[in-house]
């Protein structure tokens, strides 16, 4: 039996700059029941606060609702582990909510096979920004990637589309079924997970011309 090992703050993420969650990895428990508490202060302020919500985001996490989320403030976050034999504290993590956004994936992915005047076939992929994104006010601007592969293929082909919410994919094989997904990233944040997979079969009666 021993004091707990040092916990490590794994990551903090926000879906929308309005709320955020931090997760930690506990160290060893020293063979004893161990309690974990997350505390935080804001740079330039004296007060230290305890995590407002340990439940919403699951085990080893702290959820900061709108009421507790400020942008343009640096949070200094630590996790403390305590058991009968002693305690141990993580290294502090400095968090600016503006820089930890991981949005929901884009929505309303639509796939359509089309033809140019020269009979060249392409797949027209269109989507919308995630629901929370207030793109119009500039609160968020998103960059996007799409990925696609034929059902038989092992590897995805990735296309960066910048801020465009549509993309034309050329050189597809008639008779093949293609799977497509999209993801997005805000200016200062992280890529979302890949969104829901959509599939489409390229009809055989479309002739491909290179």
């Amino acid at each position: 039996q021993s004091p707990p090992g040092k916990p490590e703050i794994h990551k903090c993420r926000s879906p929308d700059k309005e709320t955020f969650t931090c997760w930690w990895n506990p160290g060893s428990d020293g063979g004893l029941p161990t309690n974990y508490s997350l505390t935080y202060s804001k740079e330039g302020e004296k007060n230290t606060y305890e995590c407002p919500d340990y439940k919403t985001s699951g085990p080893n996490s702290c959820f900061f609702s709108k009421q507790y989320t400020s942008i343009w403030k640096i949070y200094i976050i630590t996790v403390n582990a305590t058991n009968e034999m002693g305690s141990s504290t993580s290294d502090p993590l400095y968090v600016d909510v503006t820089y930890i956004v991981e949005p929901e994936p884009p929505r309303n992915l639509t796939l359509e096979v089309k033809q140019l005047k020269d009979k060249k076939t392409y797949l027209w992929v269109k989507w919308l920004p995630p629901t929370i994104t207030d793109v119009k006010t500039g609160w968020f601007t998103m960059e996007y990637e799409i990925r696609l592969k034929s059902e038989e293929a092992d590897e995805w082909e990735i296309h960066f589309t910048g801020h465009q919410t549509q993309f034309k994919v050329f050189d597809l094989y008639p008779g093949q079924k293609y799977l497509v997904q999209t993801r997005c990233k805000p200016d200062h944040g992280y890529w979302s997970r890949w969104g829901q997979e959509k599939s489409i079969e390229i009809p055989n009666d479309f002739t491909l011309k290179d």
Partner: antibody, heavy 120, light 107 residues
């Protein structure tokens, strides 16, 4: 006919700012990205960033991110690039270029270039 | 950032010659490669995008090939107006970067 017409040459002092304009015609301005690329005397091409006029989304080269702002005025189909805190090594020809409309990063039409000279 | 390396940096050739310029990316860029031609005092001109697609109005003596990390631009029969500097550029993801250029001169 697609055309990108840039503003005239500028001479600036170190520490000043410059704002270069790029007026587009011959196509739907909001459908294509506008890139900014510079070329120092006798040197190669350096990509600075791009803007998508449809939603003013931008992507900047990290090297310039703290000093550059790209904007558009869709009513006049004009893109602008402002570079702040100018240094002598910012002396270059600055080009605007149109992205090809599907693939973000290749540039199918270019402006004539704007020479910016930074000298005390 | 993805680095683009062109070779050779300069090259002398004669009208009618077949010329090849190569470009190597520091990581896989699939087919996201463009080639540009630039003449002194002028803006660059797009020749090829997506490694092998000729831009509108570009003569068929120009061709591009390659994928992944290794790419080539070939001019099948040099014309007097082809003497210029050529740049490759990846357009895979930001930041887009250019090669250092290949100056093609008259022998």
């Amino acid at each position: 006919e697609v055309q990108l017409v840039q503003s005239g040459a500028e001479v600036k002092k170190p520490g000043a700012s410059v704002k270069v304009s790029c007026k587009a015609s011959g196509y739907t301005f909001t459908d294509y990205n506008i890139h900014w690329v510079r070329q120092a005397p006798g040197q190669g091409l350096e990509w600075m960033g791009y803007i998508y006029p449809n939603n003013d989304g931008t992507g900047y080269n990290q090297k310039f991110k703290s000093r550059v702002t790209m904007t558009t005025d869709t009513s006049t189909s004009t893109a602008y690039m402002e570079l702040r805190s100018l240094r002598s090594d910012d002396t270059a020809v600055y080009y605007c270029a149109r992205g090809d409309g599907n693939y973000v990063g290749d540039m199918d039409y270019w402006g004539q270039g704007t020479t910016v000279t930074v000298s005390s | 950032d993805i680095q683009m390396t062109q070779s050779p940096s300069s090259l002398s050739a004669s009208v009618g010659d077949r010329v090849t310029i190569t470009c190597r990316a520091s990581e896989n860029i699939y087919s996201y490669l463009a080639w540009y031609q630039q003449k002194p005092g002028k803006a660059p001109k797009l020749l090829v995008y997506n490694a092998k697609t000729l831009a509108e109005g570009v003569p068929s003596r120009f061709s591009g090939s390659g994928s992944g990390t290794d790419f080539t631009l070939t001019i099948s029969s040099l014309q007097p107006e082809d003497f210029a500097t050529y740049y490759c550029q990846h357009h895979y993801a930001t930041p887009f970067t250019f090669g250092q250029g290949t100056k093609l001169e008259i022998k």
